[in-house]
């Protein structure tokens, strides 16, 4: 059976029908447990140093949100008015709202334990590695033990507002030239 | 297990177009990029460009942009490389590998390759 | 575009004697950056990821260290099998770039 915890790091070895493969052992997230915080630098906490999104292709990220993410968020809160919430999360600019994408996204909060494993965070951390030059170094870096087993999806009113402010922030990512409400 | 198949060799006229085809198994296609990467004969490696199913789009090394179009039919798996306006200097093996992209970020799989010799 | 110039380009060397292998980025690309090893004929394979992770299956006289712009892949003691080109890799950025290989041969 599979093994609870999983070490991040860990490669295997085998041969392939012709060509060379090394199979990730723990294809799971890596993850993050760092709690969420407000940040107006574009810098997210991780571990001792900070990951600054100011070199990120935006373009690139503004149209896989256009093209897939931003669908995937519509799908999660479906069925849920749009003025339900209130955006109480603001971001001032491209690699500010980043940030706070990042933070919201994959940083459990109180009454909402995981986001990480819905489609369109997956989506998010993979547009965050292609496009965010050494984030991916980022995410290998954190190597606490994290349980294999997937947790169940709770879809609760406190991650459905954690969603809607998702929508805010990527909605404000892709107007960078607005002025600051 | 992971395997990588590459299509057959292929011997092009200077001019016409290639594609090269890559099925993927014993994986979640949607897991991973697909990046192709080429090796002319007796040189180093070229990144060509990648294309993301999980994002169902594509980012190419400038110098092949508008030559070089990677797609990718995720019913069966299968990545393709498309070359245009081949010239002698495009004969090279053509690798496909994947990476992850939400974990490993590594290309740790590798096709078998597929020789493209451009000749008149 | 990052440059990852490798050096040396030959190193001639005997079985059971430690192999350094340098490679040097044009900028700073912290950690990102792989090492595999390719033999003729065949595709590249993965020893080295993220500058000093290690992969099971591969032996343990290969492992890698460096950050920022300098990397290197040190094999302890070389086999028979080890005589072979190996490249670096940069992933920190697109386009993704090689470095121009280091050949491994028997002295």
């Known amino acids: 059976g599979l093994n609870d915890i999983f070490e991040a790091q860990k490669i295997e070895w085998h041969e392939g029908g012709g060509g060379s493969e090394q199979k990730l052992i723990s294809e799971e997230d890596l993850g993050s447990s760092h709690h969420h915080h407000h940040h107006s630098s574009g810098l997210v906490p991780r571990g001792s140093h900070m990951y600054d999104f100011t070199n990120c292709d935006f373009e690139k990220i503004k149209a896989a949100y256009l093209s897939t993410i931003s669908k995937d968020l519509i799908t999660y809160m479906s069925g849920t008015k749009s003025t339900e919430f209130n955006n109480t999360v603001s971001c001032s600019n491209r690699p500010h709202c980043l940030t706070e994408i990042q933070s919201l996204t994959f940083n459990p909060t109180a009454g909402c334990a995981s986001l990480a494993k819905e489609m369109f965070a997956m989506k998010t951390k993979a547009a965050l590695a292609i496009w965010c030059p050494g984030y991916s170094e980022t995410q290998i870096n954190a190597t606490q033990a994290m349980k294999k087993r997937r947790k169940r999806k709770v879809t609760t009113n406190k991650c459905l507002e954690q969603v809607s402010q998702l929508q805010g922030l990527w909605r404000r990512f892709n107007r960078p030239l607005l002025k600051q409400q | 297990q992971v395997q990588l198949v590459q299509s057959g060799p292929e011997v092009k006229k200077p001019g016409s177009s290639v594609k090269v085809s890559c099925k993927a198994s014993?994986?979640?296609?949607?897991?991973?990029?697909m990046h192709w990467v080429r090796q002319r004969p007796g040189q180093d490696l070229e990144w060509m460009g990648t294309?993301?199913?999980?994002?169902?789009?594509?980012d190419y090394n400038q110098n092949f942009k508008g030559r070089a179009t990677i797609t990718a039919d995720k019913s069966t798996s299968t990545a393709y490389m498309e070359l245009s306006s081949l010239r002698s200097e495009d004969t090279a093996v053509y690798y496909c590998?994947?990476?992850?992209?939400?974990?490993?970020?590594?290309?740790?799989?590798w096709g078998q390759g597929t020789l493209v010799t451009v000749s008149s | 575009e990052i440059v990852l110039t490798q050096s040396p380009g030959t190193l001639s060397l005997s079985p059971g004697e430690r192999a350094t292998l340098s490679c040097r980025a044009s900028q700073h690309i912290s950690r990102s950056v792989h090492w595999y090893q390719q033999k003729p004929g065949e595709a590249p394979r993965l020893l080295i990821y993220?500058?000093?992770q290690s992969i099971s299956g591969i032996p343990d006289r290969f492992s890698g260290s460096g950050s920022g712009t300098d990397f290197t892949l040190t094999i302890s003691r070389l086999e028979s099998e080890d005589f072979a080109v190996y490249y670096c890799q940069q992933s920190y950025s697109f386009p993704y770039t090689f470095g121009r290989g280091t050949k491994v041969e028997i002295k």
């Open positions: 294309f993301i199913p999980l994002l169902d789009t594509s």
């Open positions: 014993g994986y979640i296609f949607t897991d991973y990029a």
């Open positions: 993220f500058a000093s």
């Open positions: 590998a994947r990476m992850g992209v939400t974990h490993s970020y590594v290309m740790d799989a």
